[in-house]
C-alpha cells in the first residue's frame, strides 16, 4: 500500500487536483472522495434570535 | 443504515499481535478514507491511522509506525488494523470511524460521522 | 505535527447555562475543524464540522465558530443531555489530531 504524504502542509501542497462532479478534493487524504452537498438555508426572519445553521446533504453511494 | 462494527480485540501480552476488524454496511468504504482511533482508559481521544481504500493511501501516528498496519478489503467491505509489538501503552477501547465530506469550492469539508461501538484491547503480562 | 489545545479542560455549569469551548490550533488551518461529543462508554458523535456547520440531526442550539488558529463551540442553552465531553480535531493535514478535551459536569 502506498502512504499519502506525511509531511505536506496546506500552504506548501500542490493545488487540489480535478474531481469528478459527485468528488471533491480532500486534503486530508490528498486525493478526490465522495462528496456531498453543502447548503445554506435562507437567513430567518428579521428579529430571530440567531442565523439559521449551516448544514449539509448526505453523499451519495 | 450505515453501521461500523469492530471486533477483534482481547487480551495480549506485550510483544503480542492482534489483528482489527471494522466490518462495514449500508455504503461502500471505497467512496471515503476510514480511521481508526482509540482511547486509553480514563484518557482522550487519539488518532492512530487512517486508510483510503479507493486507492490504498494509508497515513499513521507516530506512536504506532512500524508497529501497526492499516489495510482495507473493498470486496469484503472491511478494513483492518493489523497491531505487531503490542505495548501496555497500546491499551485502549479502538474505534473505527468513517470519514464523510461536503463540498466546499471543490474541497472537502468534512469530520467522522459514523462510528463503530469500539472494541477493547487490553496489553498485559 | 499540528497541535489543538483546547480550554478549559473542564467546566461546571447547570441546565439553561451559555456554555463556550474553545480550540486553538498551533498553526493555520483556515476552517477544518471538526467537534464531537463523546458520553462515557460511548463512540463519539460529530456535531460541527467545517468550523460551523452543523452535522445532520445536531440540536440548533449547538454552534461553531472560527477560522485561521482559533475556533469555538457555543451551546446556547445547556440541556440535561449535554452533559459530556467535548473534543475538537483539525482535518487540514494529515496527521489529523484531537484537542485534549472538555468535559462538561453539572454544577
Known amino acids: 500500500m502506498r502512504r499519502g504524504p506525511r509531511s505536506l502542509r496546506g500552504r506548501d501542497a500542490p493545488a487540489p487536483t480535478p474531481c469528478v462532479p459527485a468528488e471533491c478534493f480532500d486534503l486530508l487524504v490528498r486525493h478526490c472522495v465522495a462528496c456531498g452537498l453543502l447548503r445554506t438555508p435562507r437567513p430567518k426572519p428579521a428579529g430571530a434570535s440567531s442565523p439559521a445553521p449551516r448544514t449539509a446533504l448526505q453523499p451519495q453511494e | 443504515e450505515v453501521q461500523l462494527v469492530e471486533s477483534g480485540g482481547g487480551l495480549v501480552q506485550p510483544g503480542g499481535s492482534l489483528r482489527l476488524s471494522c466490518a462495514a454496511s449500508?455504503?461502500?468504504?471505497?467512496?471515503?478514507?476510514i480511521h481508526w482511533v482509540r482511547q486509553a482508559p480514563g484518557k482522550g481521544l487519539e488518532w492512530v491511522a487512517w486508510?483510503?481504500?479507493?486507492?490504498?493511501?494509508?497515513d499513521y501516528a507516530d506512536s504506532v509506525k512500524g508497529r501497526f498496519t492499516i489495510s482495507a478489503d473493498t470486496s469484503k467491505n472491511t478494513a483492518y488494523l493489523q497491531m505487531n509489538s503490542l505495548r501496555a501503552e497500546d491499551t485502549a477501547v479502538y474505534y473505527c470511524a468513517r470519514r464523510v465530506c461536503y463540498n466546499r469550492l471543490g474541497v472537502c469539508a468534512g469530520g467522522m460521522d459514523y462510528w463503530g461501538q469500539g472494541t477493547l484491547v487490553t496489553v498485559s503480562s | 505535527d499540528i497541535q489543538m489545545t483546547q480550554s478549559p479542560s473542564s467546566l461546571s455549569a447547570s441546565v439553561g447555562d451559555r456554555v463556550t469551548i474553545t480550540c486553538r490550533a498551533s498553526?493555520?488551518?483556515?476552517?477544518?475543524v471538526a467537534w464531537y461529543q463523546q458520553k462515557p462508554g460511548k463512540a463519539p458523535k460529530l456535531l460541527i464540522f467545517?468550523?460551523?456547520y452543523l452535522f445532520s440531526g445536531v440540536p440548533s442550539r449547538f454552534s461553531g465558530s472560527g477560522s485561521g488558529t482559533d475556533f469555538t463551540l457555543t451551546i446556547s442553552s445547556l440541556q440535561p443531555e449535554d452533559f459530556a465531553t467535548y473534543y475538537c480535531q483539525q482535518s487540514q493535514v494529515s496527521p489529523p489530531t484531537f484537542g485534549q478535551g472538555t468535559k462538561v459536569e453539572i454544577k
Open positions: 467545517a468550523a460551523s
Open positions: 449500508g455504503f461502500t468504504i471505497s467512496s471515503s478514507s
Open positions: 498553526e493555520d488551518i483556515s476552517s477544518a
Open positions: 486508510v483510503l481504500p479507493s486507492v490504498g493511501f494509508t
